[in-house]
């Protein structure tokens, strides 16, 4: 995303080569004044020297427009065209092609399966956790902690199926009524938003590809918050949801169906299994309050097991613990009954890696969490890189107008409801909603679609795993199918409610902005998105549910002036923007209050202080690993390498901490771009060079 | 092979208390109900009660409740049975038998103690 | 209690006859009966349980059968040895009930 357009000769820094260049007057009063506060003086020049003349025209090209951020950056080509290549170059671009995309299609397979194993390894980490959160009794009379704990056991499970799961077992054993399951059905669909946040942060090394990454993932989330802020209060208030799928439920006289097609798990099962196999039903198990459950291991060891019903004689504390009275007896002192008991039997063992290691859940599980966090973020950096190499000139024009333009008019509103109908079918394809948005993450990051038309893509991609809830629920057994479905159900009239609330107006389309916002801030203070994740992913839900163990006069005793104090900010922050001559003078900016309270800057400036000792270190390893990777796919040497260390560098530069000469291919445009605050020309440079 | 030998004969006067052993060999003493039953001349079997050696667990025929008392002795294999406040219809041969595992069938029997009241 | 009675109190054959005993329950006691063999001056010695299970060392010529509340035994060939005092034995409930017994006799 290049702020001005760029020359091959044309010097990077003129100012550099016109000493003593100043200006009375700047012509950008916005831009230079914010960028370069300290040249602003206003003595006049004494000396001119001349150096070497360097073509600066480029520079002063229209120096008032800044580039948005958010534009899509141009893909340039940097190859020779198809036309000018001989008969060996056109089938080598062949070969290369097909090349570039079997290692496309083996990264992204890479990149779904380290999905999966990521799930299993959170599961291993705090799956048992999750289940005891559901086994809490204040769910049936408190809407919000169920909420929260929707939210906390889909974020420690990494899989809102399997949240899903144990809340309809539950339902199916009457442990919990289907009012009472709505609030965590929602909690789940906010909790399986957090995978493709995570994937998002992957792409931090880069400010403007990080920008649009995280705006993107966390689009998912707010439309996600904002649907459970409104629909919540008016499920609590009239149980519509709960109403209407009944109706639906009672309406249909079901049949099980056939099991839902396992459509992408046919593909990354083979792999998956091989890594590790867990025994889902075990946190189910806990959910329900079986005691036995909770020594036993998650990690599957045997796969094929022989399941043997035998009577087996049982005493019983009195006769009205009997099968029946004619199969009751006595031996004098004990009460005997005759009851069917299944015994299982261990033939063959699974074969995993972790089968014949018998190491506790957690360790496999950070094993797990660790292997799997490298490979993701292995394969989503060379899915990126791929991508880049192939998304150039022509392609790019053709898959970006593909993608991004909109119907002719009038029917480009339609353009936004096939988005939704495409991504609700590309995640009932994948069979995850996870999975989807998070391959959608890099694709927005790298400037392929913009977040105005990945919304409806997420959107879709709610829809998508509600029709595969659905069909699953047809395919559950007789005494499970009615709460099954009704659930999934539930869930997929809450995702319809959420999109007519935020979507079908433009005005409406409040996450996009509200994505934006957080992509500004997460650029320019990248820690801020961890923060964002550790807030609202976990410290915001357990601290909800702290306050409801607590009771409702706790709860409603913090909760009330917290959301009262949010209300208010939000309304001032509304004015200030809107109409500020409403306010008094000392409200009409944040001044009044201590700088930490209204900007991230001194924040900023501690978490540097604690994270500026692994900085370095970690960015000479990343230039190692990259330079590398450069000679390994044969980049050349002006492949963007190492961003992050870039940045850090010119960080140190402007703090007068002495950095390497800057190399050949060093491209200063770019670490300029990566910024994420595109400057417009200095203005002493621009006066003196007119 | 499982035996159960009992004490010998008593006699007794009304009133007085009477304690029967019954020492068992040939199996795990501590697995089986020890049961007592007993048989007034020329009647039929009637179940006094049952006592499991392993934890002391008993349980008494409600006809004879406050009167017997059952005990068992694990570093012997022996069990005891104790009925006082004696009358002359408890005049019986009293016999102890292995429990099968299980259930209320009687597998094995001791050859029976007399026990004579009268006055 | 569970009462049970046998029938008949007496009973009188010859050697290789078909005898068969019967014990009727005042309840429904399922299969939770056995049949004992008693001669004078000896204790009792199992024979059947769970109404129809032959005990170990038992002549295959006894056979019990019935279930609810209505028990027989069978011996489908006396022998000589056969005479003697038969009962029957729930152990449904307790107290463990014994039936009055059922005297088989040399005709």
């Known amino acids: 995303m290049a702020p001005w357009p760029e020359l091959g000769d044309a010097q990077p820094n003129p100012s550099k080569y016109l000493e003593g260049a100043t200006s009375q007057q700047p012509i950008t009063p916005d831009k230079s004044k914010e960028t370069n506060k300290t040249d602003n003086t206003e003595v006049p020049v004494t000396k001119f020297e001349l150096l070497p003349t360097y073509s600066t025209a480029t520079l002063i090209e229209e120096p008032t427009e800044v580039d948005d951020p958010w534009n899509l950056p141009t893909l340039q080509d940097s190859g020779i065209k198809w036309s000018e290549r001989d008969a060996k170059g056109k089938i080598l671009c062949v070969f290369q092609g097909i090349g570039r995309l079997i290692l496309l299609l083996g990264f992204l397979y890479f990149f779904v399966c380290s999905l999966d194993v990521l799930s299993s390894a959170f599961q291993l980490v705090g799956g048992k956790m999750a289940g005891q959160f559901f086994s809490n009794s204040s769910i049936m009379s408190n809407p919000l902690l169920g909420l929260v704990i929707g939210v906390l056991v889909t974020v420690f499970v990494q899989s809102s199926s399997t949240s899903t799961s144990i809340v309809v077992s539950m339902v199916a054993s009457s442990l919990l009524t289907v009012r009472a399951a709505i609030p965590i059905i929602m909690g789940a669909n906010i909790g399986t938003s957090i995978t493709n946040t995570i994937v998002a942060l992957m792409q931090v090394g880069d400010r403007s590809e990080f920008r649009r990454a995280f705006a993107g993932a966390t689009v998912h989330d707010f439309f996600n918050w904002l649907s459970v802020l409104v629909l919540l209060p008016v499920e609590v208030a009239t149980h519509y949801l709960e109403v209407v799928t009944q109706l639906i439920v009672e309406s249909f006289h079901f049949k099980n169906g056939e099991d839902a097609p396992d459509l992408l798990k046919v593909i990354t099962k083979p792999f998956t299994k091989l890594i590790v196999q867990l025994d889902k039903k075990v946190i189910s198990q806990i959910a329900m309050n079986d005691e036995t459950a909770k020594n036993k291991s998650l990690v599957k060891i045997w796969c094929k097991t022989f399941t043997n019903m035998t009577q087996m004689n049982v005493t019983v504390p009195s006769m009205a613990n009997c099968t029946s009275p004619s199969l009751c007896w006595t031996d004098g002192i004990q009460i005997w009954t005759m009851k069917n008991v299944t015994y299982k039997e261990n033939i063959a063992k699974c074969q995993h890696i972790f089968v014949n290691f018998h190491l506790p859940d957690l360790a496999v599980g950070i094993i797990l969490l660790i292997i799997s966090l490298l490979v993701l973020c292995g394969c989503l950096i060379m899915i990126v890189k791929i991508l880049g190499s192939v998304l150039k000139g022509q392609v790019a024009t053709v898959i970006k107008k593909t993608i991004n333009t909109d119907f002719p008019f009038p029917f480009a509103w339609l353009t936004g409801y096939l988005a939704i109908l495409v991504g609700a079918g590309m995640t009932f394809i994948v069979q995850s909603s996870s999975v989807f948005t998070s391959a959608l993450t890099p694709l927005i990051g790298i400037g392929v679609i913009t977040i105005e038309r990945a919304y409806p893509l997420t959107l879709g991609s709610n829809i998508g795993t509600t029709t595969t809830a659905i069909l699953a629920a047809l395919a559950s057994p007789g005494n499970t199918l009615r709460s099954s479905l009704q659930i999934a159900l539930c869930h997929f009239f809450f995702n319809i409610s959420g999109i007519l609330l935020w979507y079908p107006i433009p005005f409406t389309r409040l996450p996009i902005r509200m994505a934006k916002g957080l992509g500004n801030i997460s650029a320019k203070y990248r820690w801020f998105a961890i923060f964002y994740l550790i807030i609202f992913f976990f410290l915001i839900p357990l601290t909800v549910f702290g306050l409801s163990l607590a009771g409702w006069p706790v709860l409603v005793g913090v909760g009330v002036p917290v959301v009262f104090i949010i209300i208010l900010v939000l309304c001032l922050r509304l004015l200030q923007s809107r109409c500020p001559r409403v306010l008094p003078k000392k409200l009409q900016n944040w001044n009044f209050l201590p700088l930490c309270m209204h900007s991230l800057k001194p924040w900023d400036a501690v978490i540097s202080k604690f994270t500026g000792p692994f900085q370095m270190p970690c960015c000479c390893c990343c230039r190692v690993c990259c330079r590398v990777c450069c000679l390994l796919c044969g980049c050349p040497k002006c492949c963007r390498c190492s961003k992050c260390c870039q940045d850090l560098e010119e960080g140190q530069e402007a703090q007068g901490v002495p950095v390497k000469a800057p190399e050949t291919f060093d491209n200063i445009t770019i670490s300029r771009e990566a910024q994420g605050e595109v400057r417009a020309p200095d203005s002493k440079t621009e006066c003196t060079a007119l | 092979q499982v035996q159960l030998v009992q004490s010998g004969a008593e006699v007794k006067k009304p009133g007085a208390s009477v304690k029967v052993s019954c020492k068992t060999s040939g199996y795990t003493f501590t697995t089986n109900n020890m049961h007592w039953v007993r048989q007034a001349p020329g009647q039929g079997l009637e179940w006094i009660g049952a006592?499991?050696?392993?934890?002391?667990?008993?349980a008494y025929n409600q006809k004879f409740k406050g009167r017997v008392t059952m005990t068992a002795d694990t570093s012997t294999s022996t069990v005891y049975m104790e009925l006082s406040s004696l009358r002359s219809e408890d005049t019986a041969v009293y016999y102890c038998a292995r429990g099968m595992y299980g259930h209320g069938a009687m597998d094995y029997w001791g050859q029976g103690t007399l026990v004579t009241v009268s006055s | 209690d569970i009462q049970l009675t046998q029938s008949p109190s007496f009973l009188s054959a010859s050697v290789g006859d078909r005898v068969t005993i019967t014990c009727k329950a005042s309840q429904d006691v399922g299969t939770a009966v056995a049949w004992y063999q008693q001669k004078p001056g000896k204790a009792p010695k199992l024979l059947i349980y769970?109404?129809?299970t032959r005990h170990s060392g038992v002549p295959s010529r006894f056979s019990g059968s019935g279930s609810g509340t209505e028990f027989t035994l069978t011996i489908s060939s006396l022998q000589p040895e056969d005479f003697a005092t038969y009962y029957c034995q729930q152990y449904s409930s307790n107290p463990l009930t014994f039936g009055q017994g059922t005297k088989l006799e040399i005709k």
């Open positions: 769970w109404a129809t």
């Open positions: 006592i499991y050696p392993g934890s002391g667990a008993t």
